[in-house]
């Protein structure tokens, strides 16, 4: 797999790898246009978790605001279905005892926004 | 910061920190089989990026299909604006000489979907 | 994992009205629709309503428009069904579920569900 060494390499020591420190690019920053959250056809808003033993700490969590799409005249069409941007992440755990300390890598999903979507016929029609 | 070790302890050796093998939720997946790509007023396209020494090794952007956005006749209407969703999200970057391998973390931009939002009249005035 | 607990079934009298009610727990930060369900005997798992956490609006299934009201407490992570005007062929096994994806939502997309709350109409 990705983390283990080349088959002709000693193993591991202790099932750990050496993670540099210092993160590439750790400056970026997402610009996107604003207020897109309340101004979309599929509003939603943010919930913000936050865990001081990960990294990053805050998580930012999208909700749709609604079953269905804004109109034109600024209603909600039940004809239409808001539904969730998903995105799978990284995030590194931060486990100590003492002066030891290690990390792992771990995967959370987050929804990052909503979009309006024509419905496929499903059990709610 | 989240990567050093408490004052009170001695320095990390060489920069590096213990990364432990394993990912948490490893096999945690974005239910995406509905493709909301498509049929989002606000539709996009993916385009794949592939790096061996990247964790995950395959990266998906999303673009825009549209500027307008595609009303109920199917048409683009150019009232409304498709915009980009995105996340900063983090990878893992494999450096190897010989049999030392090391990694670091590394912030990427991804654009995850589109949204159709109502325009801000800015400049066009 | 989400937890639901369904309460408020019974036996009522068609033309009758009960309030079901349904306690969510373990939801993730995300999760922005829930869902009432039944299943009749012999019969396939239905949608019956579903409910908006943040705005409120709701959805129902055309045989139950007008005479079901479904309604949520946000900040108690509870929902509720107010069924008026009951009909025998509303005798069913209820269920609440998270709809994570809505409108969207597939009926093979659940995993879990509760132990629901029996609902019978007699005539």
């Known amino acids: 797999t990705f983390f283990q060494k080349p088959e002709s390499c000693p193993p591991v020591p202790g099932g750990s790898m050496k993670l540099d420190i210092g993160i590439i690019n750790e400056n970026q920053r997402v610009s996107m246009s604003r207020n897109i959250e309340s101004r979309s056809t599929s509003p939603w808003d943010y919930t913000v978790t936050w865990d001081p033993n990960r990294y990053p700490s805050e998580v930012v969590q999208a909700q749709c605001r609604n079953l269905g799409c804004i109109n034109a005249q600024g209603k909600e069409d039940i004809s239409m279905n808001s539904v969730p941007i998903q995105q799978e992440t990284l995030v590194v755990r931060r486990k100590h005892q003492g002066c030891s300390v290690s990390f792992q890598l771990e995967k959370v999903l987050v929804t990052v926004g909503c979009t309006c979507v024509t419905p496929v016929i499903h059990h709610v029609q | 910061t989240f990567f050093q070790k408490p004052e009170s302890c001695p320095p990390v050796p060489g920069g590096s920190m213990k990364l432990d093998i394993g990912i948490i939720n490893e096999n945690q997946r974005v239910s995406m089989s509905r493709n909301i790509e498509s049929r989002s007023t606000s539709p996009w396209d993916y385009t794949v990026t592939w790096d061996p020494n990247r964790y995950p090794s395959e990266v998906v952007q999303a673009q825009c299909r549209n500027l307008g956005c595609i009303n109920a006749q199917g048409k683009e209407d150019i009232s409304m604006n498709s915009v980009p969703i995105q996340q900063e999200t983090l990878v893992v970057r494999r450096k190897h000489q010989g049999c030392s391998v090391s990694f670091q973390l590394e912030k990427v931009l991804v654009t995850v979907g589109c949204t159709c939002v109502t325009p801000v009249i800015h400049h066009v005035q | 994992q989400v937890q639901l607990v369904e309460s408020g079934g019974g036996l009522v009298q068609a033309g009758g009205s009960l309030r079901l009610s349904c306690a969510a727990s373990?939801?993730?930060?995300?999760?922005?629709?829930m869902g009432w369900f039944r299943q009749a005997p012999g019969k396939e798992r239905e949608f019956v309503a579903a409910?908006?956490?943040?705005?409120?609006?709701?959805k129902y299934t055309d045989s139950v428009k007008d005479r079901f009201t479904m309604s949520r407490d946000y900040a108690k992570k509870q929902v509720y069904l107010e069924m008026n005007s009951l009909k025998p062929e509303d005798t069913a096994v209820y269920y609440c579920?998270?709809?994570?994806?809505?409108?969207?939502?597939?009926?093979?997309?659940?995993?879990?569900w509760g132990q629901g709350t029996q609902v019978t109409v007699s005539s």
């Open positions: 579920n998270d709809m994570p994806y809505g409108l969207d939502t597939r009926m093979d997309e659940y995993v879990y």
């Open positions: 373990g939801l993730t930060g995300s999760s922005y629709a």
């Open positions: 409910i908006s956490w943040i705005s409120g609006g709701t």
